[in-house]
Structure formats: structure tokens, C-alpha cells
């Protein structure tokens, strides 16, 4: 899977979109999870409504919301009041049974608020390292991962 980078400004909202084939994933609930370490599990943050037909209803967990356009095939996640600790690698998932298929891998980067009087050049990454393959950019204040960049620091 390619990784798409979404950049947001600290204190503001960031909207992440995950397109998918609506017929292929028909009837499946969706989820947003946070990757714990490079090879660690993906910890569920929020999932769509228990009733698939009500997937369009926005569900919140803390400052993260999820809503699913099941006909159009777009899962949308909103991270409200973005904070530095929100930076990291996430996944949009499609669920069936206890299985979770990855729809998209997402790297969230948090930029410092330019109106904040602290260093406006700050950018919070989850970590930097040697390489990250198959990076992809989708502009919604987003960019592709640079060559030689990985969302997690190398494990010693």
C-alpha cells in the first residue's frame, strides 16, 4: 500500500479522505486506526456506525470523527483541534468479521500554527529514518514522503 501524507496545522481541523470501491466493500463497516510502531498493531481509534446503513452518521471518539459515504465510496476522518501528538501513521480500514482490510495508509503531519509566536517553521514528524517506499501525495495540504524518509525511527 502507498502511504498518503496529510498535513494539518496545530489547533485546526484536518480532514483525511480514503477512497474505495463501493461495491467491493459493500456492507462493510469502516475504521480508523493508529499504527503502533513500524510493525506493531493498528489500534482502533474510531469506527463507523454499527448499522452499516447508518454509516453516513458521524461518529466521534474524543477529537476524531468518522463518516462514510457508502455509495460514493469515500471514508472521511476529521481530526479536530490537531495536536503534535496526533502526528503519526494511521490506516483506513474496511471490516468484515474480525478482519480488517487496509484501504489506505495515512501519515499525519502537524505543522505549527503560523499565528503562534513560537517557531513557525516547526513540523512534527512521528520520526525520521532511512527509507519509505511507495509514497504517494494527495494535495489537501499533503505531500508524498521524501526518499529516505520513514514514519518511524529505526529500531535499535
Amino acid at each position: 500500500h502507498n502511504t498518503t501524507v496529510f498535513q494539518g496545522v496545530a489547533g485546526q481541523s484536518l480532514q483525511v479522505s480514503c477512497p474505495y470501491d463501493s461495491m467491493k466493500h459493500w456492507g462493510r463497516r469502516k475504521a480508523w486506526c493508529r499504527q503502533l510502531g513500524e510493525k506493531g498493531p493498528c489500534q482502533r481509534v474510531v469506527s463507523t456506525h454499527n448499522l452499516w446503513l447508518l454509516s453516513f452518521l458521524r461518529r466521534w471518539n474524543g477529537s476524531t470523527a468518522i463518516t462514510d459515504d457508502t455509495l460514493g465510496g469515500t471514508l472521511t476522518i476529521t481530526l479536530r483541534n490537531l495536536q503534535p501528538h496526533d502526528a503519526g501513521l494511521y490506516q483506513c480500514q474496511s471490516l468484515h468479521g474480525s478482519e480488517a482490510d487496509t484501504l489506505r495508509k495515512v501519515l499525519v503531519e502537524v505543522l505549527a500554527d503560523p499565528l503562534d509566536h513560537r517557531d513557525a517553521g516547526d513540523l512534527w514528524f512521528p520520526g525520521e529514518s532511512e527509507s519509505f517506499e511507495d509514497a504517494h501525495v494527495e494535495h489537501s495540504i499533503s505531500r508524498s514522503l521524501l526518499e529516505g524518509e520513514i514514519p518511524f525511527p529505526p529500531t535499535s
Epitope: M23, K24, W26, G27, W52, L95, H96, G97, S98, E99
Partner: antibody
Framework: QVQLQESGPELVKPGASVKISCKAS????????MNWVKQRPGKGLEWIGR????????DYNGKFKGKATLTADKSSNTAYMQLTSLTSEDSAVYFC??????????????WGQGTLVTVSA | DIQMTQTTSCLSASLGDRVTISCRAS??????LSWYQQKPDGTVKLLIY???KLHSGVPSRFSGSGSGTDYSLTIGNLEQEDVATYFC?????????FGGGTRLEIK
């Protein structure tokens, strides 16, 4: 109504390959996952894998990776399963089944009549 | 892989009897359990999905129950046409797995 018509019985030699087919009608073939299941004589059922004809994406039971290859032809509404390097262990009836998602998980709702594959010298 | 066990491989009952077929999973399958009927001619039909939901067109004498790892299929009033082999299948985790089957005969 939904129908899954599987190809006829096959008698094949050990080491050879066979390709069996499952022709679907009564629904939009490209939009539903297709399941494949093995049943050895007098034995239970084993899940081989599933394919989404819309884009050819397939998931396999690890036990059948390298043994079975699932493909689909949207123009003829037909799903195929190729079995390679056949041995007597592959002698079985093979079923295709259309998958539906009910209550958040996949269920094989419509089944083909099965194709008997016999591996014998 | 999740193992599905049907301890009774063959069951003999009389017409009109209430028959229960059991199925056990090697771990919790979250009610993602289906029951299938295979007639002597080999045709396979879905009976029950999500533990207890009756598939359309299936007679109401069939019912399912259970949770966690233990599940059962009950035929309330056995009829001649129920002579078949019954398989349970978990749809919780890939690879999907089936029980060994329970063959039901009439005494």
C-alpha cells in the same frame, strides 16, 4: 434467479494441472465476491479462497497458496480456479459460491453444483 | 487457524423429533457463525447466518443459537427432507473454516 453453473468432471494425471469454471447468471457478476470450497470424498469442507471479479483481487487460505489460482472473466461472467501439480490429495469436489455480506461478515449464499476432480494415473 | 469441531459425525432420529447439532470453535468467533445443509445429491444451501438468523426460504423449524465458542443448530420437528449433512462455518477470521459435518439420518 441466481445460478452458478460449474464445469463438468475432470480426470487428470498426477503432476498435471486443471482449470475449472463457474459461470454466474442472475446478478451483476463484477460486484460480488466469489468463494471456492473443496470437499474430499466423505470429508468436510475446506475454504480455498475468494475473488472479487471487479478487479481480480483474491484472498487465499495459506494451505492453498501455490496450489490454487483464482481468476475471473467479467466479459463472460465466469470465475475460474486453476489447480497445479496435482496429487491424489487434490481429488475432490470443488464448489464455487457467491458471497453476500450479512451482519458484517461474509456468507456463502448461492452454491454451484460442484465439479469433481479425480487425480489418477 | 480457528478449528471448528462438530463432535457428532452421525445422528439418527425419528420423524417429528427435535434434533440439536452442536459446533464448537477453538476461540471466540463473535457470533459470526453460519450453518449449511448438504443434501445427499451434493447440493449445498445456507440455513442460518450470524448464529441465529434464518436465511430466506428456510423453514421455521430450523433455528440456531450460541455465543462465544459454543453454537448449535436445532431442527424442531424433523421431516424426511431434512436428511442431509449439516456443516457449521466461522466467518470471523481468515481462513474461514468449517466443522467436519454431522450426517442426519431417519431411524
Amino acid at each position: 434467479q441466481v445460478q452458478l453453473q460449474e464445469s463438468g468432471p475432470e480426470l487428470v494425471k498426477p503432476g498435471a494441472s486443471v482449470k475449472i469454471s463457474c459461470k454466474a447468471s442472475g446478478y451483476i457478476f463484477s460486484y460480488s465476491w466469489m468463494n471456492w470450497v473443496k470437499q474430499r470424498p466423505g470429508k468436510g469442507l475446506e475454504w480455498i479462497g475468494r475473488i472479487y471479479p471487479g478487479d481480480g483481487d483474491a484472498d487465499y487460505n495459506g494451505k492453498f497458496k501455490g496450489k490454487a489460482t483464482l481468476t475471473a472473466d467479467k466479459s463472460s461472467n465466469t470465475a475460474y480456479m486453476q489447480l497445479t501439480s496435482l496429487t491424489s490429495e487434490d481429488s475432490a469436489v470443488y464448489f464455487c459460491a457467491r458471497l453476500h455480506i450479512y451482519d458484517g461478515y461474509y456468507v456463502s449464499v448461492y452454491w454451484g453444483q460442484g465439479t469433481l476432480v479425480t487425480v489418477s494415473a | 487457524d480457528i478449528q471448528m469441531t462438530q463432535t457428532t459425525s452421525c445422528l439418527s432420529a425419528s420423524l417429528g423429533d427435535r434434533v440439536t447439532i452442536s459446533c464448537r470453535a477453538s476461540q471466540d468467533i463473535n457470533n459470526y457463525l453460519s450453518w449449511y445443509q448438504q443434501k445427499p445429491d451434493g447440493t449445498v444451501k445456507l440455513l442460518i447466518y450470524y448464529t441465529s438468523k434464518l436465511h430466506s426460504g428456510v423453514p421455521s423449524r430450523f433455528s440456531g443459537s450460541g455465543s462465544g465458542t459454543d453454537y448449535s443448530l436445532t431442527i424442531g420437528n424433523l421431516e424426511q427432507e431434512d436428511v442431509a449433512t449439516y456443516f457449521c462455518q466461522q466467518g470471523d477470521t481468515l481462513p474461514w473454516t468449517f466443522g467436519g459435518g454431522t450426517r442426519l439420518e431417519i431411524k
